[in-house]
């Protein structure tokens, strides 16, 4: 893996120490020839959780264009999911305009959908 990236199974991961809105985070990953992390299994979930710690962190899952989609094209419906109870809920009550179209790890690792402009930390992933 590149310097400052962490290897696990067939992928390399980079864990941000700053925050960006979801679109900017994905753009950052793309500039590194990577993408926001696609969580494919419970084992991968635990690995990421361990490195991220108890902070909200963007992952590569969005429904900005309609249905929920992983950024690398991995099938969402048949794939691994770890939503918090009653999530995703596309909540409009935050007052920031629109619903919630981007997914993130919460402090306990469960996923939540949130407004994409919140400047959360993020995780990039690329193939080894």
């Amino acid at each position: 893996c590149p310097v400052n990236w962490v290897g696990y199974e067939g992928s390399c991961y980079w864990f941000s120490r700053s925050g960006k809105p979801w679109p900017e985070a994905e753009k950052y990953c793309q500039l590194e020839n990577a993408h926001l992390v696609v969580v494919g299994s419970w084992e991968e979930q635990k690995f990421i959780q361990h490195h991220v710690g108890p902070v909200n962190s963007w992952i590569g899952l969005t429904d900005q264009s309609g249905p929920w989609k992983w950024v690398d094209g991995t099938d969402y419906e048949s794939g691994f999911k770890n939503w918090r109870p009653e999530q995703p809920d596309d909540w409009y009550g935050h007052g920031l305009g629109g619903g919630e179209d981007c997914a993130h790890f919460t402090e306990d690792g469960g996923w939540n959908d949130d407004i994409c402009q919140r400047p959360y930390r993020w995780v990039c992933e690329t193939q080894r």
Epitope: S18, G19, N56, R84, W91, G95, L96, T106
Partner: antibody
């Protein structure tokens, strides 16, 4: 230690403009969301505006929307509040406040001492 | 907008005695991320507000352990186990789950 110092307050006539500044020190200013909160004399607290750490997003209370503009200059470690079309009900002490955590926390942990703005003819 | 309602609005307490302030929100403050976005601030006379409690029950750094917060959903309480002279001022609850951030009307605490 975290320091926030507001300046630019004073007496201004209704309909006129005023710009408040908040000089920040003791932390990495460019990593924190910043807010303005105001308090009318003898009244409670009212949140006014927030700006993201990099200035990319700004949100306002309905009472000031279209009249006030929050901005920041990260190279100068300074937060601003440009107030125009001022009304008597804008008379208040204006506090700048810093988000509790870098990038996003959604609440303020550090406050300046405040700048008094009096709108009167 | 979310309305925050505090009771009582004024409280006179004998030093060493407990005090309790209630705060009710017009909507649930539980976010999808599992956190509850409710905070308590104290404004001492002539000073800016200072953070006491974040996310319902977490004491901010340097806050004495006689202050505690509890509650969930829409009902919250700030307790002072033994009031001291330096605790006088106005206590505000605040929500930040929804913009605009909104505060309660404030509860004035004075010493008997």
């Amino acid at each position: 230690q975290v320091q926030l110092v507001e300046s630019g307050g004073g007496v201004v006539q209704p309909g006129r403009s005023l710009r408040l500044s908040c000089a920040a020190s003791g932390f990495t200013f460019s990593s924190y969301g910043m807010h303005w909160v105001r308090q009318a004399p003898g009244k409670g607290l009212e949140w006014v505006a927030i700006i993201w750490y990099d200035g990319s997003y700004k949100y306002y209370a309905d009472s000031v929307k279209g009249r006030f503009t929050i901005s920041r200059d990260n190279s100068k470690n300074t937060l601003y509040l440009q107030m125009s079309s001022l009304r008597a009900e804008d008379t208040a002490v204006y506090y700048c406040a810093r988000d509790a955590h870098d990038f996003w926390s959604g609440y303020f942990a550090y406050w300046g001492q405040g700048a008094l703005v009096t709108v009167s003819s | 907008d979310i309305v925050m309602t505090q009771t009582p609005l004024s409280l006179s307490v004998t030093p060493g005695q407990p005090a309790s302030i209630s705060c009710k929100s017009s909507q649930s403050l539980l976010h999808g991320d599992g956190k509850t976005y409710l905070y308590w601030y104290l404004q001492k006379p002539g000073q800016p507000p200072q953070l006491l409690i974040y996310e319902v029950s977490n004491r901010f750094s340097g806050v004495p352990d006689r202050f505690s917060g509890s509650g969930s959903g829409t009902d919250f309480t700030l307790k002072i186990s033994r009031v001291e002279a330096e605790d006088v001022g106005i206590y505000y609850c605040m929500q930040s789950i929804q913009i605009p951030w909104t505060f309660g009307q404030g509860t004035r605490v004075e010493i008997k």
